[in-house]
Every structure is written in structure tokens, then in C-alpha cells.
């Protein structure tokens, strides 16, 4: 007997062919001998089966001796042996309907687990293989699990169900809810305006939730909440904000925060959390602020940085177009009795300048000018 695999919710066409290429008497029955559909001359007739409103045929094929049974919106329980009776012959087709669904939701937070469950008819013994968008293969039986979802797991998962040497393919779109970057560093000179951006790695029709930015300043003993906000249908509204610093927040996505000026006391690291409606868990993004200050006090030219810098970063002081006078893997460098001219303070990583501050040193009889 012929085996046909179908997908839950899909449409399947079971074929039945007569030797005569013309419209003749036919009918389809299920394994309980209940009539599904057939013809009375050129007219379609339907029997009392549970498929009644989902069973169909195609009139134009009858003249060619083809009498298909089309079943729409397939259900697992439609799995059965279907019999086509035509020309005193019986053609049997075994239909097996499978369904593959993701646990609870297809929108999952980064780090959560994805479970795919296969619905299959009694008596079947299918195998399932799924391929993630990043090419990772997982195999299993009735359930497949992937723990610790990553951002690269977002996209279309292709799952193949194998039964009786036949296969049926499912495509499931998974959205991993996360920020585009897990962490970011902003380098600023003292007094400059600071822009923090928290772009999301996904798009959804409606986005509702609430968030908060906690900040641990390098100079402070404990962290404090700088701002709390609500998100409703992609519109941002601030609930509470500290007086110092007085952050400003954009009203639309992506989440955008502005610190009026970078000051050494603000240097440090923050953690933005976003709790989404109907989701357990939160999205996190770390943000770091490094602040640079260059000063001249009497005969001492000093350059300092505050905030989370890596030990391999180099801090240098150099006179413009000259070799560095001082260069150290430290957070402060200085030059005593600096020559007059434009001095540059540079924070660099493997030769790449991350932050630069210029200070003009005047001849000793005048006071310094900071451009």
C-alpha cells in the first residue's frame, strides 16, 4: 500500500487513477468503510465522515481518469488508510500526519532552552533531525531540546521527519530575544556628551515591557539605579531618573540614553535590563564608560582615565608630531616641566587610538589653554 506523509494544518492530495481516461463512478472511503466523497455522474457527493467539510476533489481531473481526495487543514487524527474504489478496483493509501511545535513560544530569551515536540499518529515510529540557522544538527525522537540558545540560533529551523523511507519537512521560525551586543564600551573626554545605544537583535509587531539601568561607578562603593522606564508598543516612557546624573531617554526604539557630560565620577559600568511582557527572564546588556582628563597644574602635565580599561591598554603623552614622552599600561601618566606646544593624551589598544585629548602648554610665564 502507498504511504503518504502529511503536515498538520496543511493540505494533502491522495491520488486515485482509473485506466479509462474519462469521468466514471468512484468513491473514497476510510478504513471503517465510511464514505468520504465520490460522484453521482458529474456531481460531487459527500458522505457522513468527520472529514466532510475538509474533504475535496478536483472536477477538472475526472475527465482524465484521476479522482483525487484532497484533505484540507490536516489533523493528526486524519492518519488512516483511505480506500479509493473505481472500476471494481480498490486503491489503498496510508496517510500519516505529523505535527512539529515549539515549546510554549517561538520567541525565546537568549540563554533559554528550545524544545521541539513531534506529534505523530499511534503506531508510527518516526525519527526527527533538525538543522539550526547556524548549521548545527540535532536528532531525536518525540522531543528535541537545545539548551542555552544563542543569538545565532535566531532564524528558520528546518526539521525533517522520516517514516517508512518517506520524509516530510517542517520549517519553524525561532526568534531569540536579545540585544545586538552583550557588552559595549564608550570612550569619552571629560565634559563631552555621552550617547548609549541598546539596539535589539529582533523585531516584533508589538513590544511591551519595562527596563532599568543600574550603574556601578568606579569611585562608588555600591551600584545605583540611574533610570527606570516602560516600553509600550515600541514607545518608551521614563518612570524614574536620578537627579545626578540627569539622563535623557529617546522615546522610540532602539533604546537610547544620553548623559549630558562625561565626568570622572560617572566612569564605570552599567547593566541595562529589559523585562518583556509575557516572558520569564530578562534581557541584559552591559555598558562601560571610560572618561579621560588631561590637566596641567604648575609644572606637571597629567593625563588620567577612569572606568573599566583592560590592562593591555596604553596611555601616552606626546607632543604633537613627536615621539611619545611617556607611555604606560597605567591609568595615569604625567610629564614634569613639559615643553610648550600642543600635547596629546592617547589611550590606545595595539596601536589603535581609542580616545584622544589635546592640551596646549604655553611658555612658562602664561597659564595653560585647553582647546
Amino acid at each position: 500500500k502507498k504511504v503518504v506523509l502529511g503536515k498538520k494544518g496543511d493540505t494533502v492530495e491522495l491520488t486515485c487513477t482509473a485506466s479509462q481516461k474519462k469521468s466514471i463512478q468512484f468513491h473514497w472511503k476510510n478504513s471503517n468503510q465510511i464514505k468520504i466523497l465520490g460522484n453521482q455522474g458529474s456531481f460531487l457527493t459527500k458522505g457522513p465522515s468527520k472529514l466532510n467539510d475538509r474533504a475535496d476533489s478536483r472536477r477538472s481531473l475526472w475527465d482524465q481518469g484521476n479522482f483525487p481526495l484532497i484533505i484540507k487543514n490536516l489533523k493528526i487524527e486524519d492518519s488512516d488508510t483511505y480506500i479509493c474504489e473505481v472500476e471494481d478496483q480498490k486503491e489503498e493509501v496510508q496517510l500519516l500526519v505529523f505535527g512539529l511545535t515549539a515549546n510554549s513560544d517561538t520567541h525565546l530569551l537568549q540563554g533559554q532552552s528550545l524544545t521541539l515536540t513531534l506529534e505523530s499518529p499511534p503506531g508510527s515510529s518516526p525519527s526527527v533531525q533538525c538543522r539550526s540557522p547556524r548549521g548545527k544538527n540535532i536528532q531525536g525522537g518525540k522531543t528535541l531540546s537545545v539548551s542555552q540558545l544563542e543569538l545565532q540560533d535566531s532564524g528558520t529551523w528546518t526539521c525533517t521527519v522520516l517514516q517508512n523511507q518517506k520524509k516530510v519537512e517542517f520549517k519553524i521560525d525561532i526568534v531569540v530575544l536579545a540585544f545586538q551586543k552583550a557588552s559595549s564600551i564608550v570612550y569619552k573626554k571629560e565634559g563631552e556628551q555621552v550617547e548609549f545605544s541598546f539596539p535589539l537583535a529582533f523585531t516584533v509587531e508589538k513590544l511591551t515591557g519595562s527596563g532599568e539601568l543600574w550603574w556601578q561607578a568606579e569611585r562608588a562603593s555600591s551600584s545605583k539605579s540611574w533610570i527606570t522606564f516602560d516600553l509600550k508598543n515600541k514607545e518608551v516612557s521614563v518612570k524614574r531618573v536620578t537627579q545626578d546624573p540627569k539622563l535623557q531617554m529617546g522615546k522610540k526604539l532602539p533604546l537610547h540614553l544620553t548623559l549630558p557630560q562625561a565626568l570622572p565620577q560617572y566612569a564605570g559600568s552599567g547593566n541595562l535590563t529589559l523585562a518583556l511582557e509575557a516572558k520569564t527572564g530578562k534581557l541584559h546588556q552591559e555598558v562601560n564608560l571610560v572618561v579621560m582628563r588631561a590637566t596641567q597644574l604648575q609644572k606637571n602635565l597629567t593625563c588620567e582615565v577612569w572606568g573599566p580599561t583592560s590592562p593591555k591598554l596604553m596611555l601616552s603623552l606626546k607632543l604633537e608630531n613627536k615621539e611619545a614622552k611617556v607611555s604606560k599600561r597605567e591609568k595615569a601618566v604625567w610629564v614634569l616641566n613639559p615643553e610648550a606646544g600642543m600635547w596629546q593624551c592617547l589611550l590606545s589598544d595595539s596601536g589603535q587610538v581609542l580616545l584622544e585629548s589635546n592640551i596646549k602648554v604655553l611658555p612658562t610665564w602664561s597659564t595653560p589653554v585647553q582647546p
Partner: antibody, heavy 117, light 107 residues
Framework: QVQLVQSGAEVKKPGASVKVSCKAS????????VHWVRQAPGQGLEWMGW????????GYAQRFQGRVTMTRDTSTSTVYMELSSLRSEDTAVYYC??????????WGQGTLVTVSS | DIQMTQSPSSLSASVGDRVTITCRAS??????LNWYQQKPGKAPKLLIY???TLQSGVPSRFSGSGSGTDFTLTISSLQPEDFATYYC?????????FGQGTKVEIK
């Protein structure tokens, strides 16, 4: 050639019954279903039911169920349609028509049934 | 019951015109649709079955299209003998209902 010849016009009183005949010729009578369709004066077509002359099986439109009976006489290749409990709105031309593999391809000439008190 | 709705209910056209009549089913009927032509005092005549198959002997200026719920009968170049009333009928589910008809008249 294929022909369906129907009985003549009838005038009936409300509550009475009418029996219209349809004699088939020019084809194998048992091979084709026969449908009955009526048309009230100045109105559209209304499907009433079908009969399989081979098995005698019938299928009627729900609105005529209990009032219509379709029978056949294989010896004379004739199909009959009887409509009972006649009312004035049953005044119409009644057609028999042969169903083939393509569709309802041959029609009788029609029988006018007038219901009037 | 499946309702069949034809439009327009009547139209005026001239010889040589292209005429289109539509028929809409209240639910999907796949391609189980027939078109008939009826002239005054005569029995209907089958033109098209299975939505688009021309009945033997019917001129090729008649054509049908559609599937599901929306169907069309087209007469590519109207001839004097085509002035009549046209009916669609679904052969999908009992009762096998007809449309209310479209009368094609001479302009």
C-alpha cells in the same frame, strides 16, 4: 440521437399532486443520472434533485424533502417526478435533464405545471 | 446551502463586444462550476463545466476561469445568437444551487 421527452402541461389545484414523466431515448438509460430542475415564471433555475436510473437511488434538495418523489420505469426508460401538497408558488416549468461525464448536457423540453384554485 | 451570486444581473452590449459575467460562491467549491445559456421559452444549454472546460460543440468564443469562490464566464466577441440569460451552477454540494442569472441584452 439523445432525446428527453416530457409529458404535457398540467393544471392542478392547491393541495393536489402532480406527476411529470420524462422518457429517455438515444442512449443507455441506466448509464446516466437524471436531474430535475424547475423555473418559476420570469425567475431563475432551481435544482430539485437527481435519480440514478440504474440503482433507483435518489437525492433531493432539502426544501423539497417529503414532498417530492422520483421514480423510474426501466422497461420504458422513463423517469417520473411527483410533487405533492402543491401550492401556488409551485407554478413553474419543470425540466428533466441527463447528466453525463461532462455535466447536464441534454434537457427535456419542459413541462408547465400551473397551480391555481 | 451554498449561495451562488452572479453579477451583473443584466447587461447591455453590442455585437463584437467582449462580455464578462462573474459568479461568486459563498464557500469554496474547488472547480465544481458549470455555466449554462438559456433563451426565452427554451431549456438551458451547457456551455462550460469544471469551471473552464468547454462543452463539445460550444463555440470557442466562450471561456471560463476561476477556482475556489470566484469564477468568470467570458464571451470574447458577442454574436447575435449570444443574447440570452446565463446561469452558473455549483456541482460541489447538494443542493446543487444556481446563480440568479445574468441577462445579456442588445444595446
Amino acid at each position: 440521437q439523445v432525446q428527453l421527452v416530457q409529458s404535457g402541461a398540467e393544471v392542478k389545484k392547491p393541495g393536489a399532486s402532480v406527476k411529470v414523466s420524462c422518457k429517455a431515448s438515444g442512449y443507455t438509460f441506466s448509464d446516466h443520472h437524471v436531474h430535475w430542475v424547475r423555473q418559476a415564471p420570469g425567475q431563475g433555475l432551481e435544482w430539485m434533485g437527481w435519480m440514478n436510473p440504474d440503482s433507483g437511488n435518489t437525492g433531493y434538495a432539502q426544501r423539497f424533502q417529503g414532498r417530492v418523489t422520483m421514480t423510474r420505469d426501466t422497461s420504458t426508460s422513463t423517469v417520473y417526478m411527483e410533487l405533492s401538497s402543491l401550492r401556488s408558488e409551485d407554478t413553474a416549468v419543470y425540466y428533466c435533464a441527463r447528466d453525463s461525464t461532462s455535466g447536464v448536457d441534454y434537457w427535456g423540453q419542459g413541462t408547465l405545471v400551473t397551480v391555481s384554485s | 446551502d451554498i449561495q451562488m451570486t452572479q453579477s451583473p444581473s443584466s447587461l447591455s452590449a453590442s455585437v463584437g463586444d467582449r462580455v464578462t459575467i462573474t459568479c461568486r460562491a459563498s464557500q469554496s467549491i474547488s472547480d465544481f462550476l458549470n455555466w449554462y445559456q438559456q433563451k426565452p421559452g427554451k431549456a438551458p444549454k451547457l456551455l462550460i463545466y469544471a469551471a473552464s472546460t468547454l462543452q463539445s460543440g460550444v463555440p470557442s468564443r466562450f471561456s471560463g476561469s476561476g477556482s475556489g469562490t470566484d469564477f468568470t464566464l467570458t464571451i470574447s466577441s458577442l454574436q447575435p445568437e449570444d443574447f440570452a440569460t446565463y446561469y452558473c451552477q455549483q456541482s460541489y454540494s447538494s443542493p446543487y444551487t444556481f446563480g440568479q442569472g445574468t441577462k445579456v441584452e442588445i444595446k
